[in-house]
Interface confidence: low
């Protein structure tokens, strides 16, 4: 039985040219995380964190994506095209797969506030 909950940074905003941390956290389960996949709104994979092999950043994002903190992902040099949904997929044993959603809005305004509260989707 899957008892866990994915908490995410929810809906966040950040300014163009800046950076943002995408963070998911798996709680309320003793399951062990074997792999975390990070996907963009068009379902293209940004990065993978494998328990054995460590981080793999996909070549198309190498210049703008940094691993961490933790199992999270840091997006840098944001553009307006980065606006949209991001998904974290946690592969765990023995529970199976958990999925979390984050919506990022990239703002032109220099006064854009970067909110990073944790939410349960």
């Amino acid at each position: 039985m899957m008892t866990g909950t994915i908490e995410t940074t929810g809906n966040i905003s950040a300014k163009k040219g800046g950076s943002v941390i995408l963070q998911c956290h798996l709680s309320s389960t003793m399951a062990q995380v074997t792999q975390v996949n990070w996907e963009q709104h068009d379902h293209s994979l940004l990065a993978i964190r494998n328990a054995e092999l460590g981080w793999h950043i996909y070549p198309a994002f190498k210049d703008r994506v940094a691993p961490g903190p933790g199992l999270g992902l840091t997006l840098q040099s944001l553009t307006m095209n980065d606006t949209g949904e991001y998904f974290c997929t946690y592969h765990t044993y023995p529970d199976g797969t958990y999925r979390g959603r984050i919506f990022l809005e990239v703002l032109e305004s220099s006064v854009a506030e970067h909110s990073a509260r944790f939410q349960i989707p």
Partner: antibody, heavy 125, light 106 residues
Framework: QVQLVQSGAEVKKPGASVKVSCKAS????????IAWVRQAPGQGLEWMGW????????NYAQKLQGRVTMTTDTSTSTAYMELRSLRSDDTAVYYC??????????????????WGQGTMVTVSS | DIQMTQSPSSLSASVGDRVTITCRAS??????LNWYQQKPGKAPKLLIY???SLQSGVPSRFSGSGSGTDFTLTISSLQPEDFATYYC????????FGGGTKVEIK
């Protein structure tokens, strides 16, 4: 064909160190992890740890922490296992093995699908 | 760490016999269970991965089943080359092996 070839047998004195090599061929070395497993004479198999050939990420068995170091040389597709402060109970055959998990499986299955031939390490005064 | 208990530790059988080896995990490991065969003086060989998947090149007389905590390796009709020691291994970090089952000629 896919294979792992290990260095030859070693005889060491207590307190010394040993470094065993494991050369991979026939597959993309950096797409997998290399695990090390040892087997004392007449005993079962003991997992020692692994190293990612992709980025050097390591995970060691708790009982060996501080005494073991695993490294890779991607230019020669070779993995190394160094064990320090050797004791008589470290006498064993040491195997390297390819861990079948990869980034593309979407999961850690982690079966050891390819094994080296083994390296006998004898620790004796 | 997860403990793996294999039984029996040894067994005697004849060519053509159906042989069953069991492996029990101290906690649920889903299907993260592999089986290996080892002959004297040789490296282990992977037979079954993910509890029931047959490794390429392994004869179909070998099969695996189970999930959670209880697993079974079955050899449907024992052949002369099957006399060896068999190990289960759970592949949840940190890896642990069962104690082994030696299959001997009766």
């Amino acid at each position: 064909q896919v294979q792992l070839v290990q260095s030859g047998a070693e005889v060491k004195k207590p307190g010394a160190s040993v470094k065993v090599s494991c050369k991979a061929s026939g597959y993309t070395f950096t797409s997998y992890a290399i695990a090390w497993v040892r087997q004392a004479p007449g005993q079962g198999l003991e997992w020692m740890g692994w190293i990612s050939a992709y980025n050097g990420n390591t995970n060691y068995a708790q009982k060996l922490q501080g005494r073991v170091t695993m490294t890779t040389d991607t230019s020669t597709s070779t993995a190394y296992m160094e064990l320090r402060s050797l004791r008589s109970d470290d006498t064993a055959v040491y195997y390297c093995a390819r861990s079948g998990s990869s980034f593309w499986s979407g999961d850690v299955l982690g079966a050891f699908d390819i094994w080296g031939q083994g390296t006998m390490v004898t620790v004796s005064s | 760490d997860i403990q793996m208990t294999q039984s029996p530790s040894s067994l005697s059988a004849s060519v053509g016999d159906r042989v069953t080896i069991t492996c029990r995990a101290s906690q649920s490991i889903s299907s993260y269970l592999n089986w290996y065969q080892q002959k004297p003086g040789k490296a282990p060989k992977l037979l079954i991965y993910a509890a029931s998947s047959l490794q390429s090149g392994v004869p179909s007389r070998f099969s695996g089943s189970g999930s959670g905590t209880d697993f079974t390796l079955t050899i449907s009709s024992l052949q002369p080359e099957d006399f060896a020691t068999y190990y289960c291994q759970q592949s949840v970090p940190p890896r642990t092996f069962g104690g082994g089952t030696k299959v001997e000629i009766k």
